[in-house]
Interface confidence: medium
């Protein structure tokens, strides 16, 4: 990359991080620049649970942090584009009566919402602890999509690997049956939502990420867009979490780990969400971007604008 | 996936009544089941609301006493009504809320002597 | 309890035409109202919520908007199958430490 350019990028990044401080609005770009101009962080800061190599099931080339907020915490690689909280429209609602015409959704990768519905079905079998076989998986996936089906089976294992801790293991070398393996080691999350069943705790974390990567607040459209990554969508229930709407703006602040609230001025009216007293008392930024490094393949210092800002909380709360 | 309401009928003035919310097709743990009445050529009244991820109840202030609201099985919530009076007679509505909503065909209850 | 005031009660309008009905809270109540039709012998049947979301397969001539305490629900370009009665509803909201449920009065649209 030309040296102008990135001394421009880096301009742009100080910029865009005095914002974040006012507007908290932004989806954070983690630049090539940034990665490679990164200050070296040590994990001993934080007591050493970061991992730098990457986690298992990412892509590892190349391996630099997502393009935002919403695809760092999904753990996903590639770019995505914004879709706002109407991103899908589901089948009608059993009990409507309507003789209109339905509205048309806006246009979505049909890979991308293939393997959100799998892993919606993969969630599902886990929960009811139950195998799962390739035949089972190519029903959800459809015959349309049948020669995609490795692509569309590697993004959901992705999915189910870096944001709920769940491995697919194939239970022999040439076998069609799949059994899951938990890899997370929940010591580190275990105050948060202990109460909870696993699927939905697990969606805490990477929550808590995507309101940290957007200035330490996130609009419903971009908590919306990382949800969409996982198969959740706003009016439409899922299979595990049941009903996404109550889960994030009801349950997860009634618990107070999140804050929902008008954005101040706004006209028509946005919200946003914000990290709840809970999560300032039971986790930290720098747990959170581990977290985020470790479902990323990387260490915090992908992040080091976030990374600055949680060494400095950590200072404050002498850590 | 559906909601059916049972147990409407005819009932006498300061008798008691219990309907049930049968859900089929899933589970009511992670959302709020609401009842709904709505007397003949009327609008909707809300009764009250339980949120099945916690068992938290909720109830308009008119509700409060006479009528108890809970969740009975994984799969169905009552409400409970007490001291009814002619102008309770309604159809009375189950709903799953909010953003995914889903309602019974509802249960006529009449209160007459 | 929070109380919803819907007007007008009733409105009559032509095949094609708009109809515009209002809803006021009588405290704010952020984005967490929702717009429902309800035909004769029919559960109520979600169009809008979170203020100005359209339910699924809701056609975009439906438009939802407001917030706050003033709320608006706008359908053109109507069709003899929009004539039906139309409730707006105040549903739980998360910024709010008290639980609301609470439905306006209703509208009857007549289409002509």
């Known amino acids: 990359m030309p040296r102008g350019q990135k001394s421009k990028l880096r301009a742009r990044e100080k910029r865009r991080k005095a914002r974040d401080e006012t507007r908290g609005l932004n989806v954070p770009q983690v630049t090539e620049a940034e990665e490679e101009e990164a200050p070296c962080c040590s994990s001993s800061v934080s007591g050493g649970a970061a991992s730098s190599s990457p986690a298992a099931g990412i892509p590892q080339e190349p391996q630099r942090a997502p393009t935002t907020a919403a695809a760092a915490a999904a753990g996903v690689s590639s770019t995505k584009s914004k879709k706002g909280a109407k991103s899908h429209q589901g089948e009608k609602n059993a009990s409507s009566s309507q003789a209109s015409t339905s509205t048309k959704s806006p246009s979505e990768d049909p890979l991308t919402r293939k393997s959100g519905s799998l892993v919606q079905f993969l969630l599902y079998k886990y929960k009811i602890k139950k195998s799962v076989t390739k035949g089972e998986m190519l029903k959800i996936v459809g015959k349309r999509f049948r020669e995609h089906f490795p692509e569309i089976l590697k993004k959901a294992s992705e999915g189910l690997s870096v944001v709920f801790g769940l491995e697919l293991n194939k239970v022999n070398p040439n076998g069609h049956t799949y059994t899951f393996i938990d890899k997370v080691d929940l010591t580190d999350e275990e105050s948060l939502l202990s109460s909870w069943d696993f699927p939905r705790r697990k969606l805490l974390m990477p929550l808590l990420g995507v309101i940290f990567l957007n200035g330490n607040s996130a609009t419903e459209e971009e908590i919306w867009e990382f949800l969409n990554m996982l198969g959740v969508y706003d009016g439409e229930e899922h299979s595990v979490f049941g009903e996404p709407w109550k889960l994030i703006t009801k349950d997860l602040v009634q618990e107070k780990y999140l804050e929902y609230k008008q954005v101040p001025s706004s006209d028509p009216p946005r919200f946003q969400f914000l990290w709840g007293p809970r999560a300032y008392a039971e986790t930290s930024k720098m747990k959170v971007l581990e977290f985020l490094a470790k479902v990323n393949g990387t260490t915090p210092c992908a992040f080091p604008t976030h990374y600055e800002e949680a060494l400095k909380d950590e200072e404050k709360a002498g850590v | 996936q559906s909601l059916e309401e049972s147990g409407g009928g005819l009932v006498q003035p300061e008798g008691s009544l219990t309907l049930t919310c049968t859900a089929s097709?899933?589970?009511?743990?992670?959302?709020?089941i609401c009842w709904v009445r709505q007397a003949p050529g009327k609008g909707l009244e809300w009764i009250a609301c339980?949120?099945?991820?916690?068992?938290?109840t909720y109830y308009a202030n008119w509700a409060k006493g006479r009528f108890t609201i809970s969740k009975t099985s994984s799969t169905t919530v009552t409400l409970q009504m007490t001291s009814l009076t002619a102008a309770d007679t309604a159809t009375y509505f189950c709903a799953r809320s909010l953003a995914t909503p889903l309602w019974g065909p509802g249960t006529l209850v009449t209160v007459s002597s | 309890d929070i109380v919803m005031t819907q007007t007008p009660a009733s409105v009559e309008a032509a095949v094609g035409g708009t109809v515009t009905i209002k809803c006021q809270a009588s405290e704010s109540i952020g984005n967490a109202l929702a717009w429902y039709q309800q035909k004769p012998g029919q559960p109520p049947s979600l169009l809008i919520y979170r203020a100005s979301t359209l339910a699924s397969g809701i056609p975009s001539r439906v438009k939802g908007s407001g917030s706050g305490t003033q709320f608006t629900l706008t359908i053109s370009d109507l069709e003899c199958a929009d004539a039906a009665t139309y409730y707006c509803q105040s549903y739980d909201d998360s910024s709010s430490s008290s639980f609301f449920y609470a439905f306006g009065g209703g509208t009857e649209v007549v289409v002509k």
């Open positions: 097709g899933f589970t009511l743990n992670n959302y709020y």
């Open positions: 339980i949120d099945n991820a916690n068992g938290r």
